[in-house]
Interface confidence: low
């Protein structure tokens, strides 16, 4: 039978690092949208009203907790009138996949903050990323919020040959072992093992010994 | 009247980004969409990708995983990156507009204005 | 994805002919992302029709747009020597936009 005209489809979240936002199609017509988004209480919550907009910022509302399962809806009204209804009394409007931000936000792109070099050892730090989850005022990192289901995975290479190495760490640092002399280069990975979908993140941008994030110390 | 002017980097070598951008004179971003169509040589149009003012983007899937579109309001431009470009990826890239246009209570969408287009090659 | 299919490839008329040109969906469009634009060798496209039948500005009344659902036409109701060029039919409504194949308008 095909969506009714005016009604939005393929509802999509799109989540990195818990900055969430609801994505639909198609562009409006003669109506406008309003996302519905439901709390804890399963209370629906009105967000991005009367907008001709295909995608509404949901993050306020997912990071009051990461953990929670949330739907959305996307309510259509005719242009110019918010209160306007269908044939039924209400609103044409279509359900959201339900979103658990804590199992599905995907993993941003780790940066290397830096790393240093102490005779044939090499402390290598990644950036723990801010995240929009607030806890006391404060925004929380992506080690606040994870913990020790956050793994890093470090790739590193000799920069004058291709043969890679890995190491894994809980933490935000690894400490490996190099060869006296040679530089190396460096990418790392964000990884969730816990997870069932969007386990890792894109790897970081490769970092290499020689330039100016490192130090070295005999 | 609105005039879109575009530059950038007309030869590449393959695995290089691609990166053009588009200048609004004589209006706002505001209101709009703006996007980035391309043309290979002897070849129809194919969409790439629209941001919004406010920056929000739709990308064509085909080439999401490449395409990063971005706005600068204070400048009143738009740009487009193209990631590890080949030889596929020659063509005449043309910024638009993309109007919604309001219409006896409907909205419409269309690319009114365009830019006069930059020949991108990419050969080894 | 909206596949629109463009026919005929090519259209060899005589200035002063009629022009028909159609424009087929792979699924329903709404008629209001439905466009039709105006190319001409080494230029960037020009918009002659949005909402499948509105002219833009500036486009003489010879052009017209018609057409719903799948099915969409542009008619030139006669050919001045400008109007060789080629056309494309535009979806601006689901991602990814899209754009037909093209006719291209000939001199016979």
């Known amino acids: 039978a095909g969506t009714p005209p005016g009604k939005a489809f393929n509802l999509t979240w799109i989540s990195t690092d818990f900055k969430t936002i609801l994505e639909w199609q198609p562009k409006p017509t003669n109506y406008t949208y309003t996302v519905q988004i439901s709390d804890r209480s399963r209370n629906w919550k009105y967000k991005c009203t009367g907008t001709t907009d295909t995608e509404c910022d949901l993050t306020d509302e997912i990071v009051k907790d990461v953990n929670w399962t949330y739907e959305a809806r996307v309510l259509s009204y005719p242009a110019g009138n918010v209160e306007s209804t269908g044939s039924a009394g209400e609103p044409l409007y279509e359900n959201s996949p339900e979103f658990t931000p804590y199992l599905e936000t995907n993993l941003g792109q780790p940066t290397i903050q830096s790393f240093e070099q102490v005779g044939t050892k090499v402390n290598v730090t990644v950036e723990d990323e801010r995240t929009l989850v607030r806890r006391n005022n404060t925004f929380l990192s992506l080690r606040d919020v994870f913990g020790k289901d956050l793994i890093y995975t470090l790739y590193y290479w000799k920069s004058s040959s291709s043969g890679k190495k890995t190491a894994k760490t809980n933490t935000n640092e690894f400490l490996i072992d190099v060869d006296k002399g040679e530089n190396y280069c460096f990418s790392v990975q964000a990884v969730i093992p816990s997870r069932t979908v969007n386990r890792k993140s894109t790897d970081s941008p490769v970092e290499c010994m020689g330039q100016e994030k490192g130090e070295f110390r005999e | 009247q609105v005039q879109l002017q575009q530059w950038g980097a007309g030869l590449l070598k393959p695995s290089e980004t691609l990166s053009l951008t588009c200048a609004v004179y004589?209006?706002?971003?505001?209101?709009?969409?703006w996007s980035w169509i391309r043309q290979p040589p002897g070849k129809g149009l194919e969409w790439i990708g629209e941001?919004?003012?406010?920056?929000?983007?739709r990308y064509n899937p085909s080439l999401k995983s490449r395409v990063t579109i971005s706005v600068d309001t204070s400048k009143n431009q738009f740009s487009l990156k193209l990631s590890s470009v080949t030889a596929a990826d020659t063509a005449v890239y043309y910024c638009?507009?993309?109007?919604?246009?309001?219409?006896?209570?409907?909205?419409?969408?269309?690319?009114?204005?365009w830019g006069k287009g930059t020949t991108v090659t990419v050969s080894s | 994805e909206i596949v629109l299919t463009q026919s005929p490839g090519t259209l060899s008329l005589s200035p002063g002919e009629r022009a028909t040109l159609s424009c087929r969906a792979s699924?329903?469009?709404?008629?209001?992302?439905l466009a039709w634009y105006q190319q001409k060798p080494g230029q960037a496209p020009r918009l002659l029709i949005y909402?499948?039948?509105s002219r833009a500005t500036g486009i003489p009344d010879r052009f017209s747009g018609s057409g719903s659902g799948t099915d969409f036409t542009l008619t030139i109701s006669r050919l001045e020597p400008e109007d060789f060029a080629v056309y494309y039919c535009?979806?601006?409504?689901?991602?990814?936009?899209?754009f037909g194949g093209g006719t291209k308008v000939e001199i016979k």
């Open positions: 535009q979806q601006a409504g689901v991602v990814p936009y899209t």
């Open positions: 638009a507009r993309d109007t919604p246009y309001y219409y006896e209570g409907g909205y419409y969408y269309y690319m009114d204005v």
């Open positions: 909402g499948a039948y």
């Open positions: 941001i919004g003012a406010s920056g929000s983007t």
């Open positions: 004589g209006g706002s971003l505001s209101g709009y969409y």
């Open positions: 699924q329903s469009v709404s008629s209001s992302f």
